[in-house]
């Protein structure tokens, strides 16, 4: 049987070497004489040759000094021959434990760590972790137990321990109020890692703390009075430009400014954030009116994208808006005039008076008056007065100018401010109808075959409105009544059948047709009547020879 | 001299509302976390609120969520707790404090809040 | 139940000394040096004595000492007078919300 006490050699062993461990016996070497070997790992195995044993005396020893953080175990068997060679035991596991030595300080993982943490925070908020390890033995020793502190914190403001560290853990939390990134943005910290839980060997690395922003300050205006001015009129003009200062952070939400104008109820200004530098541009919403109102004083708020993470003041400005006066056109009253006038109304005669009021009350001005559009030229203005005559006779059924018995004329007013301004106005007359047209045909020219003519459909057509107009009556005159008969196409009489009596011969004839309106206005028409070659219904029409100047009635 | 001083204690039915306040003077009042802590009759000390030197950040105990509101007047050196729906249990001697680094102090000399019918 | 544990009370002769624990973990009087003490006489505010295990703000007499080993942290008086009887409670920072935690107390009474 093998007698093996238990083995352990420190690291980082002195020496001198090699060393006595420990001496290994077999119970056998009262039988005869025993030699000893090893095998094994620092023996015949790399490392070859940290432990020998001696052949005779069993004394296993260390040839070299041990690192345990290269190796904290080595196995090994020793065996036991004769001198014969043969072997007087089974061979043994030997387990050689390196114990550790405090030889490796901590080492930080990182040697900058960042962190950030709200400006504001409160004590107790976790801003960071620093973490270092230790290659030394954590289980049975306090070679590796590391312990962190803060060594130093630049700023030291406002207070020289606004961080604290956990010293088992190394998270770093806020010990101390008065966080403000606009005083001190950033914090460094040196942190120390020291084995033993704080007493040992030790390191150091930075910690750096950005404090971050919250919208802990607001806007102000600077200057707070401005003044500005705007012809009137005019929208989207800018009058002035309004400047603050925010001591957040710079394009960032809780430094954008938004702003507010506090006494405008009738939205006839706007302010605008310049995304660049913050500035409010005040311009006009709408067009403003100097008659009405001079002068604004507008009173103007500022605050941020996002609500006050505090409670904080909303800086005011007053900005005082001078309206400028600006020669505006007279406006016609009403812009759009209506007028009823009978068509055979007197030449040179007024119809109307049609004037234009001066918006620039505060100005002494003169209006002149002309028109400008009379497409048909029956109309003249009086150029002091406004007073509108006819200058020619007026004509409902002018349909190249008058539309649904309208015709419209435009008059313009023109001031003597500088610069002229002018405005115009729409006359539209309504000319009511006078019976001054009679009946006609349509067609006037009329197609028959010679043979089986089929009836033709005259359309009576008068240009005036009723009761100037239908029912019709017609009547054949001057003799066509002798091969001709005309009737009534529909109950309104407004178009007739005209056919032949006979059969007529091919050529031209000319019939005298009398059309009576309702009012008895009456119109003698001669309709131009051809008799074609033919069959049934005219088409192309074959003529012969001319009909005899007899035939012709 | 560094002092605070509370005020506004006093017998409030169950249900009903009751505001603290607390006077600085001495030292920068904005520079420093307040905290309201409390002390029922016969027993230990229990934090209930807190808030930051901006006001920006406040704290509230479980105890009190929902029902107490802490907040600051910088320009008055004046700490506020509004007390509402209050319990029997919410009966107590409030103290406000400051916090310095790490550590609590100086202290009000307290309040009595009864909760009772 | 406290998050600090104390003893609900301790006692002793004028003259003689004794001591006050305080036992927390390691992620407060363990993990930092923020403990502090008070002295609390019936009726009145507490009265910082120690801060920072065993720093004396100026006034506070010095037979009040602190110190602290491991997770507990410890309030030494000596030379008791009978104007130490009072109750005593410790606190230590912690990271997160609340930030400070207190002892339940100790009852000091002074025979």
């Known amino acids: 049987d093998w007698v093996i006490p238990p083995i352990s050699c420190p690291e980082n062993e002195k020496g001198p070497f090699p060393k006595n461990l420990v001496q290994i016996k077999s119970n056998k070497d009262k039988e005869g004489k025993v030699f000893y070997s090893i095998t094994g790992q620092g023996a015949d195995t790399p490392p070859v040759g940290v432990f020998i044993i001696e052949r005779e005396t069993g004394w296993l020893k260390v040839t070299e000094p041990l690192d345990r953080e290269r190796i904290a175990t080595y196995t090994l068997f020793s065996h036991a021959v004769s001198s014969n060679g043969n072997a007087v035991e089974d061979p043994m596991e030997i387990l050689i434990t390196v114990t550790d030595q405090n030889d490796n300080k901590p080492e930080f993982t990182q040697e900058v760590f960042k962190g950030s943490v709200m400006e504001g925070a409160l004590p107790g908020t976790s801003v960071m972790e620093v973490t270092a390890t230790d290659a030394d033995d954590d289980v049975n020793t306090y070679n590796a137990a590391i312990a962190y502190t803060i060594l130093s914190q630049d700023p030291e403001l406002p207070d020289k321990n606004m961080f604290t560290i956990n010293r088992n853990t190394g998270v770093i939390s806020v010990v101390t109020t008065g966080l403000d990134r606009e005083s001190f943005p950033t914090y460094t910290l040196v942190v120390q890692a020291a084995d033993l839980q704080g007493e040992g060997l030790s390191t150091t690395a930075t910690a750096v703390i950005t404090v971050t922003d919250t919208n802990d300050n607001p806007p102000i205006f600077n200057p707070t009075t401005y003044k500005g001015q705007v012809p009137e009129n005019e929208a989207n003009v800018v009058i002035t430009t309004l400047k603050v200062t925010d001591a957040d952070a710079p394009n960032t939400p809780a430094w954008e400014a938004v702003y507010t104008i506090l006494n405008d109820d009738g939205g006839q200004f706007v302010v605008t954030t310049n995304p660049v530098n913050n500035d409010g541009i005040l311009k006009t919403a709408k067009g403003l009116d100097f008659e009405a109102k001079q002068q604004y004083i507008l009173h103007v708020a500022v605050t941020n994208v996002v609500p006050f993470e505090v409670s904080l003041t909303t800086s005011t400005a007053t900005v005082t808006v001078d309206v400028l006066d600006v020669n505006e056109a007279p406006i016609f009253v009403p812009p759009e005039k209506r007028v009823e006038v009978s068509e055979d109304f007197g030449v040179g005669q007024e119809i109307t008076s049609y004037t234009a009021q001066e918006p620039d009350t505060f100005m002494e001005q003169k209006i002149t008056y002309r028109i400008w559009r009379d497409t048909a030229n029956w109309l003249e203005i009086n150029p002091d007065t406004g007073a509108i005559s006819t200058r020619a006779e007026l004509d409902r059924e002018d349909f190249e100018h008058v539309k649904n018995s309208t015709y419209t004329a435009l008059i313009i007013a023109t001031d003597n401010g500088s610069p002229v301004a002018t405005g115009t106005g729409t006359l539209l007359l309504i000319l009511s109808d006078v019976n001054d047209n009679a009946p006609i045909p349509e067609p006037r020219t009329i197609f028959f075959c010679e043979r089986n003519p089929k009836p033709q459909v005259i359309n009576i057509i008068d240009a005036d409105l009723p009761p100037n107009t239908s029912p019709f009556t017609a009547e054949l005159t001057h003799g066509a009544s002798a091969n001709w008969t005309i009737q009534y196409n529909d109950p309104t009489q407004e178009s007739i059948i005209l056919k032949p009596k006979m059969a007529l011969e091919v050529g031209d004839y000319k019939i005298n047709l009398k059309l009576m309106d309702n009012q008895n206005k009456d119109q003698v028409t001669t309709l131009e009547v051809s008799v074609c070659d033919c069959e049934g219904a005219a088409g192309v029409c074959r003529k012969a020879q001319p009909v005899e100047a007899g035939l012709q009635i | 001299e560094v002092q605070l001083l509370e005020s506004g204690g006093g017998l409030v039915q169950p249900g009903g509302s009751l505001r603290l306040s607390c006077a600085a003077s001495?030292?920068?009042?904005?520079?420093?976390?307040m905290s309201w802590v409390r002390q029922a009759p016969g027993k230990g000390l229990e934090w209930v609120s807190a808030i930051s030197g901006s006001g920006g950040s406040t704290y509230y105990a479980d105890s009190v969520k929902g029902r107490f509101t802490i907040s600051r007047d910088n320009s008055k050196n004046t700490l506020y707790l509004q007390m509402n729906s209050l319990r029997a249990e919410d009966t107590a001697v409030y103290y406000c404090?400051?916090?310095?680094?790490?550590?609590?102090?100086?202290w009000g000399q307290g309040k009595m809040v009864t909760v009772s019918s | 139940q406290s998050a600090l544990t104390q003893p609900a009370s301790v006692s002793g002769s004028p003259g003689q000394s004794i001591t006050i624990s305080c036992t927390g973990t390691?992620?407060?009087?363990?993990?930092?040096?923020?403990v502090s003490w008070y002295q609390q006489h019936p009726g009145k505010a507490p009265k910082l004595i120690l801060s920072e295990v065993n720093k004396r703000p100026s006034g506070v007499s010095n037979r009040f000492s602190g110190s602290k080993s491991g997770n507990t942290a410890s309030l030494s008086i000596s030379g008791l007078q009978a104007e130490d009887e009072a109750d005593y409670y410790c606190?230590?920072?912690?990271?997160?919300?609340?930030?400070?935690?207190f002892g339940g107390g100790t009852k000091l009474t002074v025979l």
């Open positions: 404090a400051s916090w310095g680094t790490g550590t609590l102090w100086p």
């Open positions: 606190s230590s920072f912690t990271s997160g919300l609340p930030w400070v935690l």
């Open positions: 001495g030292f920068t009042f904005s520079s420093y976390a």
């Open positions: 390691s992620n407060d009087v363990g993990a930092y040096n923020y």
